[in-house]
């Protein structure tokens, strides 16, 4: 049977303690036993059968006395079975046993919930020898109990390879409710129901839960822990907490903010990181995400030229890393650029528009209608062409580069000529006779050299041959033209 000794009880102390079988909570003995002088334990009171040793784990010594009487069985004396006290209070409890003096080196160990208590515990063992027996009292004290001290404590003693075990002493530390699960902050969709959970434990039980939303109690009557609150939906941010009540009082959980997911704020600080002729690298600072992670972003690009048709190019990209290279742009052009990002709720407004320009680029097309003539009288090759369309010059034309390759009998020689931007014709000297001259022309801007035109070949005969017709850029798909005179 378990007896309860409550901290509130103030039993009449028979004698000042501590004594074998005594218990102290807050240094007030709840059960004290008398003793004779010399600390020899007298009768030990048991909650069930006063004066009888307990019938638990007993060792029966095999040694007999001079008169050959067998020694009585060894057992721990009864003590209080159940101690209930408040957190942070002090408690002291003990085990006592009387051991015949024939046994040497007896030690008592304390165990809690099946594990030996070692080290930094306030355990004291005192010995009170008499003629035939030694009374051993093992005391265990805790100065400021915590919940972790809850449990079942026992004493163990080894004698003659026998283990003697005391009855358990149950320590129950009571206090304010302790949260094992508190509501968590959440981001929720507007007007959509969601759940919050709150769980708290004693002792003492039961623990009752009240929910609070924005300082108003949601349930006017308590709900047993654990409690799940179904919030029927919110239209604006709210703060929730739960109150846990037991007989010791109340504990309030942390307040958690429940946010309403919304469309993000527009990105800010859109800036140009780098410009080339056909691309612009931009970065931006994302706006507030509206309590929902960004999914992707959209870059909107429109020509700033007032004469343009105002069409908008849209480039979609991932939300990270807040960087995007806009490609396929025209060179030397002005653009307005805006960025918008989306989360699960929708798209943000567009950021403030910024102006950006592409740089000059190398022309994107070659000169057109390249024609090559041999002027034998002056021993020159005349070249004519048409300049590429202005739109495709990708910059201000600064001139042309002419490549002419001379091939004859295993010899090949390439020469380059630079021509000013004004002309659309050039004359080059014949380098080798009885050879093929292959001519290609590229337009040049400050942005670089554009692509070369398709090759035009002309055969340069030995001296004294007749005049001949010009050679021209081939129509698409034709083989390289070679004019043989």
């Amino acid at each position: 049977a378990i007896t309860e000794a409550r901290e509130e009880a103030k039993p009449y102390p028979l004698f000042p303690g501590p004594f074998p079988g005594s218990l102290q909570t807050d240094h007030t003995p709840l059960l004290s036993l008398p003793h004779a002088s010399g600390y020899q334990p007298a009768l030990m009171f048991s909650p069930t059968q006063p004066g009888r040793p307990h019938t638990g784990n007993v060792a029966i010594p095999q040694v007999t006395s001079v008169e050959s009487k067998p020694l009585p069985p060894l057992a721990f004396k009864h003590t209080v079975g159940h101690i209930i006290l408040s957190e942070h209070k002090g408690v002291k409890f003990n085990c006592s046993i009387s051991v015949p003096n024939i046994y040497q080196d007896t030690t008592i160990s304390w165990w809690k919930d099946g594990k030996e208590l070692l080290g930094a515990h306030h355990a004291i063992t005192q010995f009170y020898p008499d003629d035939e027996v030694t009374a051993i009292i093992a005391s265990f004290s805790i100065t400021s109990v915590q919940r972790s001290d809850n449990g079942s404590y026992i004493c163990k003693m080894k004698i003659n390879n026998e283990e003697i075990v005391s009855d358990p002493i149950y320590i129950e530390v009571q206090g304010l409710p302790h949260f094992t699960k508190q509501p968590e902050s959440m981001n929720v969709t507007r007007n959509t129901a969601f759940n919050l959970t709150c769980q708290a434990v004693g002792p003492p039980e039961p623990v009752n839960i009240f929910w609070v939303q924005n300082s108003s109690r949601v349930n006017e009557q308590p709900e047993k822990s654990p409690s799940v609150l179904t919030v029927p939906g919110l239209t604006e941010m709210a703060v929730f907490s739960c109150e846990a009540h037991n007989d010791k009082g109340l504990t309030v959980s942390k307040g958690v903010q429940i946010n309403i997911k919304a469309i993000p704020s527009p990105p800010t600080e859109v800036s140009i990181r780098n410009s080339t002729a056909h691309s612009i690298l931009i970065s931006w600072v994302p706006g507030f995400d509206g309590y929902s992670p960004f999914r992707n972003c959209s870059i909107q690009v429109k020509e700033a030229d007032p004469l343009s048709n105002g069409s908008v190019m849209i480039f979609n990209t991932s939300a990270l890393p807040h960087l995007y290279q806009i490609k396929q742009l025209q060179a030397l052009a002005n653009y307005s650029i805006g960025v918008s990002c989306m989360n699960e709720i929708g798209w943000s407004a567009v950021s403030p528009w910024i102006l950006a320009s592409t740089t000059e680029g190398a022309p994107s097309v070659a000169p057109l209608n390249v024609t090559v003539f041999l002027n034998e009288s002056s021993d020159n090759v005349d070249i004519r062409w048409m300049k590429p369309p202005t739109k495709q010059q990708d910059g201000e034309l600064v001139g042309y580069r002419i490549s002419h390759v001379w091939q004859s009998a295993g010899i090949s020689k390439e020469l380059l000529e630079e021509v000013g931007q004004n002309g659309s014709r050039a004359r080059i000297s014949v380098q080798v006779h009885n050879a093929t001259c292959t001519v290609r022309i590229a337009a040049v801007t400050r942005g670089g050299v554009g692509p070369f035109s398709d090759p035009v070949k002309i055969f340069i005969p030995a001296h004294g041959w007749v005049d001949y017709a010009p050679s021209s850029t081939p129509a698409p798909g034709n083989a390289d033209p070679v004019l043989i005179i």
């Epitope: 007007n191 929910w211 939303q213 924005n214 108003s216 949601v218 349930n219 006017e220 009557q221 308590p222 609150l229 179904t230 029927p232 939906g233 239209t235 709210a238």
Partner: antibody, heavy 118, light 106 residues
């Protein structure tokens, strides 16, 4: 299913007392608070207050402090409204209604007409 | 205490029409509940917590709003919807009801 059944109509003289009952069934009586709502003839609804069926503690709206008493007999899952020193202006239909979270009144009694007339 | 003002006080409507009843609170509230009361009957919960349909209520009823302005909407009115409608706030004690809106079917 959940039901709230109220006692029948009462005709009382000014100065007398009346006790209206509201018997609940179909749920655990002590889980939900019991409210009382008054509706004077041709008028709207007025919340009188509620009683905590778990602790027995009553809460009264300001206009109903004094002559109005809420009480319980949990053994028979019944809530009571007692009005003392009746006046003519107490003539009304009195409803009991339960609420849970967020104080919406999901279940109502059928109403009890209390007529105060000399 | 929070005062709830419903408008209109009275409305006469033909079947299949759309009806909107508004409830304005004297200060911000967390939720608004709506009830329907027919003559000589108890009130019946229609909408709980601003926008949630109570069980067994036809889907032609809906609720919306936040802060101080809330709305009960009846799409395609039916003859059986003739009743008085009340709003009730949650968020500040004491609980209060609106004065009611009487709906008559022409």
């Amino acid at each position: 299913q959940i039901q709230l059944v109220q006692s029948g109509s009462e005709l009382k003289k000014p100065g007398a007392s009346v006790k209206v009952s509201c018997k609940a069934s179909g749920y655990t009586f002590t889980n939900y608070g019991m409210n009382w709502v008054r509706q004077a003839p041709g008028q709207g609804l007025e919340w009188m207050g509620w009683i905590n069926t778990y602790t027995g503690e009553p809460t009264y709206a300001d206009d109903f402090k004094g002559r109005f008493v809420f009480s319980l007999d949990t053994s028979v899952s019944t809530a009571y409204l007692q009005i003392s020193s009746l006046k003519a202006e107490d003539t009304a239909v009195y409803f009991c209604a339960t609420y849970g979270h967020y104080a919406w009144f999901a279940y109502w009694g059928q109403g009890t007409l209390v007529t105060v007339s000399s | 205490e929070i005062v709830l003002t419903q408008s209109p006080d009275f409305q006469s409507v033909t079947p299949k029409e759309k009806v909107t009843i508004t409830c304005r609170a004297s200060s911000s509230v967390s939720y608004m509940h709506w009830y329907q009361q027919k003559p000589d009957q108890s009130p019946k919960l229609l909408i709980k917590a601003t926008s949630n349909l109570a069980s067994g209520v036809p889907s032609r009823f809906s609720g919306s709003g936040s802060g101080t302005d809330f709305t009960l909407t009846i799409n395609s009115l039916e003859a059986e919807d003739a009743a008085t409608y009340y709003c009730q706030q949650w968020g500040t004690k004491p609980l209060t009801f609106g004065q009611g809106t009487k709906l008559e079917i022409k």
